[in-house]
């Protein structure tokens, strides 16, 4: 089942995905695609990283966090209703059938029509993240027998619009991450 994330038309959407590299520099290729994760790779790839860099991306899709430390969360800029749907984050761990696949459902809501702004609303518009809530869901852990010392933790519900890369560290300590090594 997919975890659901929401954004309004015109906002940036945030789809979280994390892993912890086994050691600094030991990056794992990651792909993001539109549509549920297929058996292999990602369908309709929008962004891809390799062992060193982001090596493919399309307009409006980017990584805002520190992907060299495993924060491969996807930001989609200036979303429209057409961006609704399932997105696949695939951590491409070496070995046969070792990939971790995460299906994230993005729901785009029409932009709210707001009355003429008051001073207080101006403040809220200037600092929208002050009002963001951050939810941590339960985690489910599995161990791969075919790769020694690789511990994978299923991504669970993270708050929408988490943009600060430091939060990756808070989240991984609450189980919202994949640990490799």
């Amino acid at each position: 089942s997919e975890v659901e994330y929401r954004a309004e038309v015109g906002q940036n959407a945030y789809l979280p995905c994390f892993y912890t590299p086994a050691a600094p520099g030991n990056l794992v290729p990651v792909c993001w695609g539109k549509g549920a994760c297929p058996v292999f790779e990602c369908g309709n790839v929008v962004l891809r990283t390799d062992e060193r860099d982001v090596n493919y991306w399309t307009s409006r899709y980017w990584l805002n966090g520190d992907f060299r430390k495993g924060d491969v969360s996807l930001t989609i800029e200036n979303v429209t209703l057409a961006d609704s749907g399932i997105y696949c984050c695939r951590i491409q761990i070496p070995g046969i059938m070792n990939d971790e696949k995460f299906n994230l459902k993005l729901v785009i809501k029409p932009a709210k029509v707001t009355p003429a702004p008051t001073r207080q609303r101006d403040f809220t518009a200037a600092f929208p993240r002050m009002l963001t809530t951050r939810g941590h869901g339960p985690a489910e852990t599995q161990t791969l027998g075919s790769l020694p010392d690789i511990n994978l933790t299923q991504i669970s519900t993270l708050a929408n619009e988490l943009r600060d890369s430091r939060l990756a560290n808070d989240l991984r300590d609450s189980g919202a991450t994949i640990r490799i090594g």
Epitope: P21, A23, P24, G25, V54, N64, D66, R68, N169
Partner: antibody, heavy 125, light 108 residues
Framework: EVQLHQSGPVLVKPGASVKMSCKAS????????MNWVKQSHGKSLEWIGV????????TYNQKFKGKATLTVDKSSSTAYMEFSSLTSEDSAVYYC??????????????????WGQGTSVTVSS | DIVLTQSPATLSVTPGDSVSLSCRAS??????LHWYQQKSHESPRLLIK???QSISGIPSRFSGSGSGTDFSLSINSVETEDFGIYFC??????????FGGGTKLEIK
């Protein structure tokens, strides 16, 4: 303020091993990679390796593989470096240094924003 | 390995002078270059990151420039506390780092 406090100077015999420590304070230890750097007397700086305190994974300069072993103790926010089979060439000051904050994906790697005071190692018979 | 060559090895200046220290990389490193100051019997201190980005708490007389293979650290009106050794470091080959040989800034 962020501080990295290193263990004191040591005098060791050739062939011995030494384990030095670097205790971090005033920041979340697991959030920043920790580097170790060697400075021989009157010489430049040489990067030894880096460790991720979150999971203990380490990456080494090829020159120091088998010579240096990096470990951490998350519970005490302490990083360790063990140097083995010491020779006179290993006499130096050794620093721990924290990788700085993430600065954006258009840059590669990190600067080292906080350094320990150094541990002096003298290898002599 | 990327080699960083610093020049000059020693620079003798009078307080109040403005100076420029050079760091040249053996291949392009974009702007993944950082500058450190080390005073006698002290640890290195980060002065500039990513070629030109200032560091909180570092006096504004220190500035950095360059990209690709040629970089410079400028000190506008040197003060007596600025004497010491200056090192450049590249992070382009992260997680493997290398340092330059250093430039010693001394009083004339």
């Amino acid at each position: 303020e962020v501080q990295l406090h290193q263990s004191g100077p040591v005098l060791v015999k050739p062939g011995a091993s030494v384990k030095m420590s670097c205790k971090a304070s005033e920041y979340t230890f697991a959030d920043y990679y920790m580097n170790w750097v060697k400075q021989s007397h009157g010489k430049s700086l040489e990067w030894i390796g880096v460790i991720n305190p979150y999971n203990g994974g380490a990456t080494y300069n090829q020159k120091f593989k088998g010579k240096a072993t990096l470990t951490v103790d998350k519970s005490s926010s302490t990083a360790y470096m063990e140097f083995s089979s010491l020779t006179s060439e290993d006499s130096a000051v050794y620093y721990c240094a924290r990788d700085a904050d993430f600065y954006g994906n258009s840059y590669v790697g990190y600067a080292m924003d906080y350094w320990g005071q150094g541990t002096s190692v003298t290898v002599s018979s | 390995d990327i080699v960083l060559t610093q020049s000059p090895a020693t620079l003798s200046v009078t307080p109040g002078d403005s100076v420029s220290l050079s760091c040249r990389a053996s291949q392009s490193i974009n702007t993944d270059l950082h500058w450190y100051q080390q005073k006698s019997h002290e640890s290195p201190r980060l002065l500039i990151k990513y070629a030109s980005q200032s560091i909180s708490g570092i006096p504004s007389r220190f500035s950095g420039s360059g990209s690709g293979t040629d970089f410079s650290l400028s000190i506008n009106s040197v003060e007596t506390e600025d004497f010491g050794i200056y090192f450049c470091q590249q992070s382009h080959t992260w997680p493997q780092y290398t340092f330059g040989g250093g430039t010693k800034l001394e009083i004339k």
